[in-house]
Amino acid sequence: FERTRSLQDPCSNCPAGTFCDNNRNQICSPCPPNSFSSAGGQRTCDICRQCKGVFRTRKECSSTSNAECDCTPGFHCLGAGCSMCEQDCKQGQELTKKGCKDCCFGTFNDQKRGICRPWTNCSLDGKSVLVNGTKERDVVCGPSPADLSPGASSVTPPAPAREPGHSPQ
């Protein structure tokens, strides 16, 4: 079947990095500069993505793969393939439409992105607060009050785990 298809369609022989040039009797021509084809048998090459402004080049375009962008310092990627760059805030802040805003009391954000979230209410999960929350850190929940025997020595809690961070996929 593959052989038959190749006889019928000469374009199927054109590898990635080339295109099937109708103007030249369906000869496989290399992709022109600043373009690529990531699969074989293509009749055109795609224009390379350009990483400009707040975007910076993470991976250069080649004849077989598109360029990849990330964001300049102070910004982070959003969307599939880093389609946008969004301003970083400090820990203890959230990005609103009016810019970075401090977390209100009772909320925290330990990332440079995302929202201020309410501290975990340990009692709802039958636990007690081991370490109080701050603008930058959630509370640390420990055993339920009933599990702590009177006079038990205080336990030094582990450092709070890093909140989920979303690195560009």
């Epitope: 609103t96 909320t107 995302g114 929202i115 509370v139 909140e163 989920p164 979303h166 996929q169």
Partner: antibody, heavy 120, light 106 residues
Amino acid sequence: QMQLVQSGAEVKKPGASVKVSCKASGYSLEGYYMHWVRQAPGQGLEWMGWINPNSGGTNYAQKFQGRVTITRDTSASTAYMELSSLRSEDTAVYYCAREGEAVGLDLDYWGQGTLVTVSS
Amino acid sequence: SYELTQPPSVSVAPGKTARITCGGNNIGSKSVHWYQQKPGQAPVLVIYYDSDRPSGIPERFSGSNSGNTATLTISRVEAGDEADYYCQVWDSSSVVFGGGTQLTVL
């Protein structure tokens, strides 16, 4: 391929508890908050709460506080939602949903849903 | 608590433009996300952060948000767009959904 696969349908009696699981694949469970949303027959979407799979920190909608517990097992890449003291009004499809990256908290991937029927 | 109001239903002829609104107090200051849900299926994110489209969502879907109203616009409506649509915001300590709008393609 990013996927959230939930456990199968459940039939429960009033007063009982139900525990629904949500297994993540194609990404690291610890990387994103996980939410639970339910939908009663013919009704809209209702948010129940989230878990930070990294630390185990939770936040529950006021309506469900005291009845819902969201947990996770990172080694199994699975989040769980347990609802207790079930009543007929809890009959619904329960969804897990991954929090996305947008400003203001979006839910970018959803499980297929688990139908929980509460009937005597 | 914060409330989002959507019309229960919107009807539109194929090829025309559908507009679904989502009302909320000063909603323009919040980020609005929109979900499409077809019968028997899980919701799908179609617009996030007011107007951005996830990969795989057609350009026919667009969003806007200002004042007290956010709007999901579907241009050149197709039969396959028939579904329920929900708006959603984050409000200080909870995720809030609108009541949903059933889009009927005539």
